[in-house]
Amino acid sequence: GWVWNQFFVIEEYTGPDPVLVGRLHSDIDSGDGNIKYILSGEGAGTIFVIDDKSGNIHATKTLDREERAQYTLMAQAVDRDTNRPLEPPSEFIVKVQDINDNPPEFLHETYHANVPERSNVGTSVIQVTASDADDPTYGNSAKLVYSILEGQPYFSVEAQTGIIRTALPNMDREAKEEYHVVIQAKDMGGHMGGLSGTTKVTITLTDVNDNPPKFPQSVYQMSVSEAAVPGEEVGRVKAKDPDIGENGLVTYNIVDGDGMESFEITTDYETQEGVIKLKKPVDFETKRAYSLKVEAANVHIDPKFISNGPFKDTVTVKISVEDADEPPMFLAPSYIHEVQENAAAGTVVGRVHAKDPDAANSPIRYSIDRHTDLDRFFTINPEDGFIKTTKPLDREETAWLNITVFAAEIHNRHQEAKVPVAIRVLDVNDNAPKFAAPYEGFICESDQTKPLSNQPIVTISADDKDDTANGPRFIFSLPPEIIHNPNFTVRDNRDNTAGVYARRGGFSRQKQDLYLLPIVISDGGIPPMSSTNTLTIKVCGCDVNGALLSCNAEAYILNAGLST
């Protein structure tokens, strides 16, 4: 049988002679040279050579374990003369023994990491990992230890894991934002003679809200003209906050002061300024100075740093009111006056009244804006503001007239105010009611003496141009002279409509194909007005159900109220 022992060769051997790997030996080998040893398999004859008598195997080349860690070879023992196998062919392995010839290498040449400022000591920042190509199962060639070369005392690294942690409390982004750390990985467990590799880690402190906003001054001075209109900007304040992003966002509020009703503040998020605007008009003659207490506060507060607070600051804003020559002021924002229609020219409609608010108290002159009174219905007394009519007015033409009245200072025509004046024209019953439409009635021919139906021939209604008080209720009737008309009657429905009914049947087109029925309509005014309207009633051929078949005047009119 084969006699085996371990076959190995040290990698990277560079001696002058081939290195002995081991010896093939059979226990039937008597040493007479009758046995011939044959080597085959991976690297046989090139890397590994055998002395076929002694069975000694030598490595002829330098081997690299990191390239190939083992070789599988086949051993044979045969009779030197007959080549007859003396042992069964057998596989064996030659192992390449490791030496520490590879340094540790980091996965990345540089790393980038973030950690919030003011993080607690020991906060994990990032894990860096190195690898070593040497054999981890043999010796310490691949046993790595991490250490920090640059970056102390701010950061530390765990020797076994490569986890970088914060090492200093209260690191402040506002003082230093970026750190450059160098980490070393060394093999041989970190001992002398070990190989090493390094990597650079750039660590950025991210912002937290650890700074309150601060006004750079304790008082702001501003001024506003009394002529300024609400919404107009008065001035700006700005609190500085060294934090960035949403941690640095500031919002402004007025928290106190005698100007709280007259001024407001909004936040300009582009510039992070507080914009003070006029909320209500100010009057130099009434009050000449205002004071505001303005607060700047962070929008987003971090609960962890609440004890650093308060995250707000206040400042005093003093606003002085500047005098302006103001236009006259009407005593009312608008006026409503009434006048009866048909009133004689020169009738007084009403009065407007304005005053100069300035200390000078200049006299006022009034005028009508002629663009608003193109028909010149009205005049105004320039000195006292009384408005009068120039002609009778017709409510049915215009029920409301809207004019604009100007008031100007006598010494400065540019200082002018205007006011809308609405004039309601009151109704007088000066229109009689009329048919609401050009009604036409149709009645069926019949040889029956009774009316064919108790339905109205047509239902009529009326229109009156006057106001409702002088319009409905409308009363419909036949004129007194034909009240007992044998053919038709009018029944007032008491809802501003009336039905026209046939009093008999037996209408014949040959006898008479058209009837003209006068109808009196009077309105509900005091005194009432009335008109006589003529209803045309045509006699038509109908079917037994009362539906039209034909009329002599075929161009009959369809009405919503039509019924036959």
Epitope: C542, V544, N545, A547, L549, L558
Partner: antibody
Framework: EFQLQQSGPELVKPGASVKISCKAS????????MNWVKQSNGKSLEWIGA????????SYNQKFKGKATLTVDQSSSTAYMQLNSLTSEDSAVYYC????????????WGTGTTVTVSS | QIVVTQSPAIMSASLGERVTMTCTAS???????LHWYQQKPGSSPKLWIY???NLASGVPARFSGSGSGTSYSLTISSMEAEDVATYYC?????????FGGGAKLEIK
């Protein structure tokens, strides 16, 4: 409840005549005109004509003049329609229907009588 | 005579869907004389809507009618299974009275 009860189905030969009846109940027969409507198999409705039960006056659709004759018997509150010279075109369901005079709509319909003309 | 045309002749609708059918007259018809009838297979027609927009007794409020002149319509705000039927439009403005060809309503 207003009802119009019509006579039963009729199977008649071409050229013959048929008289179908419509008995009214639940209302005053003479207050409403009676109308007749034809519905051919699966088709729409066609007005045949109408009769005033008070006077016996009638109106016919031009298409049915000479084909249909409408009569009433006030004593039994019954309306009749006679169809003559029957052809296969006259096979249909025939309805009597009451007319509401004011707006002229058919507010009550009979049960329908099926007439089949076949040799 | 006045010719009455209904469209569509057949229509399918899902339950809960809004349904509208139209009726067109060849000449102007007073709204007082435009009516609608419902007919189910094997039954007589029933008055459904009279004078354009008035619901006959017992007709559900989901039905409505509108129109004027030559154009009229019947609408069901939310289709229900019991609404499956044929609907006929009818004018009696002028004699002879005429009916539309019918609109058959089915469930989708």
């Amino acid at each position: 409840e207003f009802q119009l009860q019509q006579s039963g189905p009729e199977l008649v030969k071409p050229g013959a005549s048929v008289k179908i009846s419509c008995k009214a109940s639940g209302y005053s027969f003479t207050d409403y005109n009676m109308n007749w409507v034809k519905q051919s198999n699966g088709k729409s409705l066609e007005w045949i004509g109408a009769i005033n039960p008070n006077y016996g006056t009638t109106s016919y659709n031009q298409k049915f003049k000479g084909k249909a004759t409408l009569t009433v018997d006030q004593s039994s509150s019954t309306a009749y329609m006679q169809l003559n010279s029957l052809t296969s075109e006259d096979s249909a369901v025939y309805y009597c229907t009451r007319l509401y005079y004011g707006s002229r709509y058919f507010d009550v319909w009979g049960t329908g009588t099926t007439v089949t003309v076949s040799s | 005579q006045i010719v009455v045309t209904q469209s569509p002749a057949i229509m399918s609708a899902s339950l809960g869907e809004r349904v509208t059918m139209t009726c067109t007259a060849s000449s102007s018809v007073s709204s007082s004389y435009l009516h609608w009838y419902q007919q189910k297979p094997g039954s007589s027609p029933k008055l459904w809507i009279y004078s354009t927009s008035n619901l006959a007794s017992g007709v559900p409020a989901r039905f409505s009618g509108s129109g004027s002149g030559t154009s009229y319509s019947l609408t069901i705000s939310s289709m229900e299974a019991e609404d499956v039927a044929t609907y006929y439009c009818h004018q009696y403005h002028r004699s002879p009275p005429t009916f539309g060809g019918g609109a058959k309503l089915e469930i989708k």
